[in-house]
């Protein structure tokens, strides 16, 4: 680890704090051992070099120890997510030590000053961990640092400065501004802990990205592509949260990382799975639902340790609220066209029927365009567990229900004005469940009628397990 005393001088000299509070020299960071699920409880303040509070407050040396590290604050008070996370950790790990790192005085400043304070806060945590390591039975392996926003980079510094290696760091939407593209020693990075997992929920490729876009852990998970989170749109926020403003949309999306982590703690029986993929677009196309070679993982607390040579970017869809889990399906549809129809942009919908439930009518998102006489892959997801799939209804939306669809139809007509009979043929649909990895093939209910046109529907029934049909000789190639 790099020495905390470098050319910059002592870390304490680096503190960026208002002159008004420099009169009394106090540690700028406090460690509060949360001894109760009750947020009103005072907890116990731990003091470096003082063993009595550890004993008095029942610090369990052999148990897991969580350090929760908040981020930048405009209000100077602990935000409500903190209580939720503390409570969830206590619920899941009854014997664990849950420590809140209070660096509010250093975080309640201009963002740039708070950023400049992250290093010294990380050092304070490292010193606390070094002191705890002197105690019998305390092991860094059992230490899990959980940092939100700016706190994720604080955790990175702590992991960097500590003597030894902490077991795990979870970065909950690590802050982007002033960290994007930074050197690995100046931000959270995979070498800061034995396992570094990251949730990215507010990344933007345009405008200011509050959360960091680049992968910074061993696994980097981008729920809903890491940008627009369901339930955080202006309309949702206006109805359900204090302050229906852009600020609240930002807070909702940025903070979603915390709630996904809380969900993974309290809804153990409903784990959300993420799938490795090179980018969000490929995931949206449905071509990344493989679990082979560690290509899928649970998200949040239940993530399995993966220490790849390279960063692993993973994606998933979620619901708008807890429990966030959805069920992902890859749908492969081979589209035949007997007429040269030019460029065509059908608006397809599917309804899945299962042994447990039926899905709602789900849109097939066309990421680029429908390829004719080729296999097209789509991603669909349902909020409920449908059980075993039995049949699929495919609908081609008819009369335009939106200006966009009207424009699509007009464009289609302009490119092929003498082709009123738009028609495609689909003989079967191959489906793969992301959660079970089960592959199924669905055949057109009426093999004589496989054509579909605007305003029409086709029904498909399960005709076999797996994807290979009797008349197919080439083996199915597993998708990446």
């Amino acid at each position: 680890s790099p020495t905390p005393f470098g050319p910059e001088g002592q870390l304490e000299d680096e503190l960026h704090k208002p002159k008004a509070i420099q009169t009394e020299v106090k540690p700028s960071v406090r460690f509060n051992l949360r001894t109760s699920k009750d947020p009103e409880h005072e907890g116990c303040y731990l003091s470096l070099g003082h063993s009595q509070p550890l004993e008095d407050c029942g610090f369990n040396m052999t148990a897991k120890t969580f350090f929760i590290i908040h981020g930048w604050t405009m209000s100077g008070i602990f935000e409500n997510w903190l209580h939720k996370l503390v409570s969830a950790l206590h619920t899941r790990e009854k014997d664990a030590n849950v420590v809140v790192v209070d660096w509010l005085p250093l975080a309640h400043q201009l963002y740039t000053d708070a950023v400049n304070n992250t290093r010294v806060v990380g050092h304070s945590i490292a010193r606390m961990l070094d002191w705890l390591q002197e105690k019998d039975d305390f092991s860094l392996e059992n230490v899990h640092l959980i940092g939100y926003s700016l706190g994720a980079h604080v955790a990175g510094y702590a992991g960097n400065f500590v003597k030894g290696t902490v077991g795990r760091i979870t970065g909950l939407d690590p802050a982007g501004p002033m960290f994007e593209g930074a050197d690995i020693h100046k931000r959270l990075s995979p070498d800061d802990a034995d396992f570094v997992d990251v949730l990215h929920t507010y990344t933007r490729s345009f405008g200011l990205s509050i959360g960091i876009q680049m992968p910074v852990g061993h696994i980097d998970i981008y729920p809903n592509g890491g940008d627009f989170q369901p339930g955080c749109g202006l309309n949702d926020v206006l109805g359900s949260m204090a302050y229906g403003t852009i600020t609240e949309v930002v807070k909702c999306e940025h903070e979603r990382a915390v709630h996904l982590f809380v969900d993974s703690l309290v809804n153990q029986d409903k784990p959300s799975f993420a799938f490795q993929c090179t980018d969000s677009n490929r995931f949206k196309k449905g071509i990344c639902l493989s679990c082979r070679k560690n290509r899928c993982n649970s998200i949040g607390y239940n993530a399995k340790k993966m220490r790849n040579k390279r960063n692993s970017k993973m994606y998933l869809k979620t619901r708008a609220g807890m429990p966030f889990r959805v069920y992902h399906y890859q749908m492969k549809i081979h589209v035949f066209s007997y007429k040269n129809m030019g460029e065509i942009e059908p608006t397809f919908y599917v309804t899945l029927y299962g042994t447990n439930a039926d899905s709602q009518t789900l849109p097939l998102e066309i990421v680029e365009r429908i390829e004719q006489n080729a296999t097209n892959t789509f991603l669909v997801y349902t909020e409920e567990d449908l059980g075993d799939l039995l049949k699929i209804q495919l609908t081609w939306e008819g009369a335009s229900q939106s200006w966009y669809n009207l424009w699509k139809e007009l464009r289609s007509y302009l490119s092929q004005p003498h082709n009123p009979g738009r028609e495609l043929n689909i003989r079967r649909i191959r489906v793969k469940s992301g959660e079970t990895q089960r592959k199924l093939t669905f055949c057109a209910e009426d093999p004589e009628n496989t054509s579909i046109s605007p305003g029409r529907e086709l029904w498909f029934r399960k005709c076999r397990d797996g994807w290979r049909m009797k008349n197919e000789t080439s083996p199915t190639v597993e998708l990446p």
């Epitope: 009103e40 005072e42 303040y45 100077g76 005085p105 309640h108 359900s240 949260m241 302050y243």
Partner: antibody, heavy 120, light 112 residues
């Protein structure tokens, strides 16, 4: 038991300065934030802001920025409210009230109030 | 800022009857299943006293005849059965994690 004891009533002239104290006992002073609340005669309660009793960082509500200052004497477990350049409209009862940093920010203990009269 | 509107401004209730006071917030004060709404009682010449926190939790030493309910933007304080000593002014107060924190205009309760 937990107590917040405030200094006695004050009679001041416009333009003068007043400093009201709030002494805490029965709990660890630095583990709870301290609020200041104004109540003009016959009027409702108005939150003025709060001070972090550990770091000394104050936060003021918009209407109380400028002439108002929160401070601490941590060794004496005491919080202070100073009002400079007093105006007639500062005539009110001022309360200190604590809240838990980790809780849901309600004010569980209040001082008895300090009545300030500003009159020429 | 979140504006809290209390109604009625005053009410008179017979001994042993129910008193109901309403508080409406200009925006939701909920967060992930919790409501950050509190109620205080203030008698003349005294400081306010915490009655209810987080919409429905009874403050320390507060008798069970006081109860709070509601979520989002609409909250209610109920006192039943009303006793002589309950004559006071009652204030609602929102304490979301984004100050400024604000109080309602108060409701004066008289006992008939």
């Amino acid at each position: 038991q937990i107590q917040l004891v405030q200094s006695g009533p004050e009679l001041k002239k416009p333009g003068e300065t007043v400093k009201i104290s709030c002494k805490a006992s029965g709990y660890t002073f630095t583990n709870y934030g301290m609020n200041w609340v104004k109540q003009a005669p016959g009027k409702d309660l108005k939150w003025m802001g709060w001070i972090n009793t550990y770091s000394g960082v104050p936060t003021y509500a918009d209407d109380f920025k400028g002439r108002f200052a929160f401070s601490l004497e941590t060794s004496a477990s005491t919080a202070y409210l100073q009002i400079n350049n007093l105006k007639n409209e500062d005539t009110a009862t001022y309360f200190c009230a604590r809240f838990s940093y980790y809780g849901r920010h309600y004010f569980d203990y209040w001082g008895q109030g300090t009545t300030l009269t500003v009159s020429s | 800022d979140i504006v809290l509107t209390q109604s009625p401004a005053s009410l008179a209730v017979s001994l042993g009857q129910r008193a109901t006071i309403s508080c409406k917030a200009s925006q939701s004060v909920d967060y992930d299943g919790d409501s950050y709404m509190n109620w205080y009682q203030q008698k003349p010449g005294q400081p306010p006293q915490l009655l209810i926190y987080a919409a429905s939790n009874l403050g320390s030493g507060i008798p069970a005849r006081f109860s709070g309910s509601g979520s989002g933007t609409d909250f209610t304080l109920n006192i039943h059965p009303v006793e002589e000593e309950d004559a006071a002014t009652y204030y609602c107060h929102q304490s979301t994690d984004d100050p400024p924190w604000t109080f309602g205009g108060g409701t004066k309760l008289e006992i008939k």
